[in-house]
């Protein structure tokens, strides 16, 4: 039982347990497709343990393989809403540094009002993740409908 | 190699590796939108290691941040089925204790027959998670189509 | 701090951190519904740490409970494409050894162009996972649209 106690006494960050779950703060100005996120216990059930927010975008603090997940629901949406305004697409990618820019995850809404997915991907300290919502539809800000998170899985 | 051996000898529960994957048992009576779950090796590939079932609802036994995931498929469903019977919505939330009641995850079927999503959320010992399916459509009981699970991620 | 250093010095495999993320290589010949996967740093952001590929199918090397996740997007697809050619269904299952053959995860596209889901499931060393796409539509090979992965979670 001594090991388990020792494990508890270590700072969790030294074990590499970086994790974050964010809620939508706002969308960008017209020509900026990025979603802007916020997190912290004062806001509800969102949090950042390791990663940080940089102007509403998530910045990674520890190298490793991460599970990235996202759900985005369109505001006041029915199946006809989505089909009237297609294409509405959500892409999650590394947007900085520019040398590492890449799309990690992409989904279109088609006749649905919600997209949700997840994937494993290597991320490096300093990588900033951006979530781009292309199209003219507003996402819901309800915290149970739209959220974005990462979880460090292994070095 | 001694550390890895020591780690194996410790009870897994002391490492906080609580995890559960459940299959649908049945729906509730007419005015009860909750889905009732079951789990255990005798039932197939479902299991509970740490969390428990309380009258078909999942009760958490260890504080921490959890990855909650769910997939629900509607029974004998085609894309037109879902549109015939609006609105069908699935919500996962803490339903007890009442003081911590909150919706964690919400999805509508619109013209689809399956919803699937996942999120990170803090849960506390004693929290009971309920999955509410509003609308009048029966969910599939096939174990590869409808399932619900949690995985402890970090303290 | 000594424990964290010791942890880093151990081979990660001894901690059971098996993980893989694969990208689509190709579909099978006409009567073979299986998707064939590939992975490795030379291919982009896909990787195998522990599991292996056997003729494009993922073989597990360590017993345990795994998080299995998948996203498949149909090529050059609109909501009408999917509805014209239904049923298009994606199933993830253990395909060998034959004695353990079982469907783990099943989703239909209906009027959508992407399916994405995840689940926890026990897997054993030697289990081979197959992903069967039934129907006549080609999946996208874009690495941000179609991917498949597993993550070891606990013994």
């Amino acid at each position: 039982q001594r090991f388990a106690q020792a494990q508890q006494q270590l700072p969790l960050e030294s074990l590499g347990w970086d994790v974050a779950e964010l809620q939508l703060n706002h969308t960008g100005p017209q020509q900026d497709p990025r979603l802007y996120w916020q997190g912290g216990p004062a806001l509800g059930r969102s949090f950042l343990h390791g990663p940080e927010l940089d102007k509403g975008q998530l910045r990674i603090h520890r190298d490793g393989i991460y599970m990235v997940h996202i759900q985005v629901t369109l505001a006041i949406c029915s199946s006809t809403t989505a089909s009237r305004h297609h294409p509405t697409t959500l892409a999650v990618g590394i947007c900085s540094p520019a040398s590492r820019s890449i799309s990690l995850l992409r989904l279109s809404f088609h006749q649905g009002c919600t997209i949700a997915s997840q994937r494993l991907t290597p991320l490096a300290r300093g990588d900033t993740l951006c979530t781009n919502l292309t199209g003219t539809l507003l996402p819901s800000r309800n915290t149970d409908e739209t959220f974005f998170g990462v979880q460090w899985v292994r070095p | 190699q001694r550390f890895a051996q020591a780690q194996q000898q410790l009870p897994l529960e002391s490492l906080g590796w609580d995890v559960a994957e459940l299959q649908l048992n049945h729906t509730g009576p007419q005015q009860d939108p909750r889905l009732y779950w079951q789990g255990g090796p005798a039932l197939g590939r479902s299991f509970l290691h740490g969390p428990e079932l309380d009258k078909g609802q999942l009760r958490i036994h260890r504080d921490g941040i959890y990855m909650v995931h769910i997939q629900v498929t509607l029974a004998i469903c085609s894309s037109t089925t879902a549109s015939r019977h609006h609105p069908t919505t699935l919500a996962v939330g803490i339903c007890s204790p009442a003081s911590r009641s909150i919706s964690l995850l919400r999805l509508s079927f619109h013209q689809g027959c399956t919803i699937a999503s996942q999120r990170l959320t803090p849960l506390a010992r004693g929290d009971t998670l309920c999955t509410n399916l509003t609308g009048t459509l029966l969910p599939s009981r096939n174990t590869d189509e409808t399932f619900f699970g949690v995985q402890w991620v970090r303290p | 701090q000594r424990f964290a250093q010791a942890q880093q010095q151990l081979p990660l495999e001894s901690l059971g951190w098996d993980v893989a993320e694969l990208q689509l290589n190709h579909t099978g010949p006409q009567q073979d519904p299986r998707l064939y996967w590939q992975g490795g740093p030379a291919l982009g952001r896909s990787f195998l740490h522990g599991p292996e590929l056997d003729k494009g199918q993922l073989r597990i090397h360590r017993d345990g409970i795994y998080m299995v996740h998948i996203q498949v997007t149909l090529a050059i697809c609109s909501s009408t494409t999917a509805s014209r050619h239904h049923p298009t269904t994606l199933a993830v299952g253990i395909c060998s050894p034959a004695s353990r053959s079982i469907s783990l995860l099943r989703l239909s596209f209906h009027q959508g162009c992407t399916i994405a889901s995840q689940r926890l499931t026990p897997l054993a060393r030697g289990d081979t996972l197959c992903t069967n796409l039934t129907g006549t539509l080609l999946p996208s090979r874009n690495t941000d649209e179609t991917f498949f992965g597993v993550q070891w979670v606990r013994p």
Epitope: - | T81, R84, H85, H86, L138, N142 | -
Partner: antibody, heavy 120, light 111 residues
């Protein structure tokens, strides 16, 4: 309590149109679908179609070309129209409520029936 | 279409005995973890009345002497002990897909 009351003519000329109204009480047409079934000594019970809460209708393919089912939620009424009746359409016509589960497709309450004879 | 074949067409039976009515489907009526077979009772001059849904679930208010069983394509309605008020025609119905179809009926007659 749940009731379905049917009204319509008993006698229809061959090639003419049949119209039946089903007025429901004790439940809302925005919550429950309503089926139409007919019964004859020769063919037994035949399912004709169903109108759902959204107004979407599913028809038996054998009758789709001459059947029209509509409703008025505010009046709690469902309207059944069948064209081009022949003598073999002589039957008892029923409306029946779909059970609570929309994809279970069972009828838990039935109207009293409308006896229809097709004859000149 | 799924064809439902009921047997026997007529079943004469004494009060207090067990009545067994069979229904065979031309193909499986199972899907999504359920079996979509149901039973109705019809008395002369009345509409059918739902007795049992999803093979074995008793509709509210139906006496416990009625029971249903079966799987795949073969199903059975049992009544035990048969009472006088059970004299009626019994129909099976599937709801696996459209069109919904019914069996031709089994007439339960008291001897």
């Amino acid at each position: 309590q749940v009731q379905l009351k049917q009204s319509g003519p008993g006698l229809v000329q061959p090639s003419q149109k049949l119209s039946i109204t089903c007025t429901v009480s004790g439940f809302s047409l925005t919550t429950y679908g309503v089926h139409w079934i007919r019964q004859s000594p020769v063919k037994g019970l035949e399912w004709l179609g169903v109108i759902w809460t959204t107004g979407v209708v599913d028809y038996n393919a054998a009758f789709i070309s001459r059947l029209n089912i509509t409703k008025d939620n505010s009046k709690s009424q469902i309207f059944f129209k069948m064209n081009s009746l022949q003598t073999n359409d002589t039957a008892m016509y029923y409306c029946a409520r779909n059970s609570y589960y929309g994809n279970l497709y069972v009828m838990d309450y039935w109207g009293q029936g409308t006896s229809v004879t097709v004859s000149s | 279409d799924i064809v439902l074949t009921q047997s026997p067409a007529s079943l004469p039976i004494f009060l207090g005995q067990r009545a067994t009515i069979s229904c065979r489907a031309s193909r499986s009526v199972s899907a999504s973890g359920y079996t979509f077979m149901h039973w109705y009772q019809q008395k002369p001059g009345q509409p059918p009345k739902l007795l049992i849904y999803l093979v074995s679930n008793l509709e509210s208010g139906v006496p416990a002497r009625f029971s249903g069983s079966g799987s795949g394509t073969d199903f059975t309605l049992n009544i035990h002990p048969v009472e006088e008020e059970d004299a009626a025609t019994y129909y099976c119905q599937h709801s696996r897909e459209f069109p919904l179809t019914f069996g031709a009926g089994t007439k339960l007659e008291l001897k």
